[in-house]
């Protein structure tokens, strides 16, 4: 079968890298400079993906690949196969259309990406707050406070470590 | 605010050269990211993409005109500049600079045009 | 380099109605897609970026769509101040124009 088909079509047994070039008699030629057949019986090769302004050439393109690119430093990839480029901003940030802005007070960030996101809200669970929160971080909500017995701490001292071998005191 | 003011533009005789300007507010062309360039428009016709500069100085010419155009920045007055030699009628057009991407989302586009200057090659 | 080719060159249309126009790239340029208007006089605008993300301050009657060598504008219901020339714009590699189309009043 595959024998037929190449009698058919000359242009089938020109494999990745190469193309089936009309101009000179259907002969299989490299693909130029600057471009790729990423399969074979290809009757023109495509051209690169040119990684430009802010974007930087994170693979090469080859005879048989396309190349691939990802953001400068201080940017974060956005969209199908990083075709736009994000401005990173610190923990305890978001990015607004005038730049970096501090989360406001309730509300944190913990990555160079996204949104402030609110603390949580321990009350909801029936739980207090053990650790509070701030702009790069959340709170950590700890026991009830009916958990606790009267006149303890809200904050519980870590317990021992524990030995292998040994039985908890 | 970001802003792009061209200069540089008028009558200009067939062989001889033209420097052109643009000048940019708001923004740093030297700042990570930022990525400038020139477009070209002949008069009743379609846009022509001629060349751009990066912030870090890396160049991207048009293949057809890559011989006769220099593109480069002065980072002390953050202005941008299109040398284009050997000039000839078909280069009569109004010429943009244009700023890749938008305020903080940055890609293969042009968020912001300057008002664009015209060049008339003729003698 | 990649053509773009634009269609139609020119259209009459009114108030009201839906447009579409359409890009053809001589390859896949799949995302790197953006869509500019322009005025007589004025600088492009830019409406639609990465083939479908309306750019800041552009009306919901524009949207972007397609795919590979395929693309569309489309214009859900032409407003007076819409009638301009329309390009679509690669950046897949380097840069280049479509030729434009002239959305005209009938």
């Known amino acids: 079968f595959e024998r037929t088909r190449s009698l058919q079509d000359p242009c089938s047994n020109c494999p990745a890298g190469t193309f089936c070039d009309n101009n000179r008699n259907q002969i299989c030629s490299p693909c130029p400079p600057n471009s790729f057949s990423s399969a074979g019986g290809q009757r023109t090769c495509d051209i690169c993906r040119q990684c430009k302004g802010v974007f930087r050439t994170r693979k090469e393109c080859s005879s048989t690949s396309n190349a691939e690119c990802d953001c400068t430093p201080g940017f974060h990839c956005l969209g199908a196969g990083c075709s736009m480029c994000e401005q990173d901003c610190k923990q305890g940030q978001e990015l607004t259309k005038k730049g970096c802005k501090d989360c406001c007070f309730g509300t944190f960030n913990d990555q160079k990406r996204g949104i402030c996101r609110p603390w949580t809200n321990c009350s909801l669970d029936g739980k207090s707050v053990l650790v509070n929160g701030t702009k790069e971080r959340d709170v950590v909500c700890g026991p009830s406070p009916a958990d606790l017995s009267p006149g303890a701490s809200s904050v519980t001292p870590p317990a021992p470590a524990r030995e292998p071998g040994h039985s908890p005191q | 605010e970001v802003q792009l003011v061209e200069s540089g533009g008028g009558l200009v005789q067939p062989g001889g050269s033209l420097r052109l300007s643009c000048a940019a507010s708001?923004?740093?062309?030297?700042?990570?990211?930022?990525?400038v360039g020139w477009i070209r428009q002949a008069p009743g016709k379609g846009l022509e993409w001629l060349a751009l500069i990066d912030w870090a100085g890396d160049k991207s010419y048009s293949t057809s005109l890559k011989s006769r155009l220099t593109i480069s920045r002065d980072n002390s007055k953050n202005t941008l500049y299109l040398q284009l030699n050997s000039l000839r009628a078909e280069d009569t057009a109004v010429y943009y600079c244009a700023r890749g991407g938008s305020d903080t989302v940055l890609g293969d586009w042009f968020a912001y045009w300057g008002q664009g200057t015209l060049v008339t090659v003729s003698s | 380099d990649i053509q773009l080719t634009q269609s139609p060159s020119s259209l009459s249309a009114s108030v009201g109605d839906r447009v579409t126009i359409t890009c053809r790239a001589s390859q896949g340029v799949s995302p790197y897609l953006a869509w500019y208007q322009q005025k007589p006089g004025k600088a492009p605008k830019l409406l639609i970026y990465d083939a479908s993300n309306r750019a800041t301050g552009i009306p919901s009657r524009f949207s972007g769509s397609g795919s590979g060598t395929d693309f569309t504008l489309t214009i859900s219901s032409l407003q007076p101040e819409d009638f301009a020339t329309y390009y679509c714009q690669q950046g897949y590699s380097t840069w280049t124009f479509g030729q434009g189309t002239k959305v005209e009043i009938k």
């Open positions: 708001g923004f740093s062309l030297s700042t990570g990211g930022v990525a």
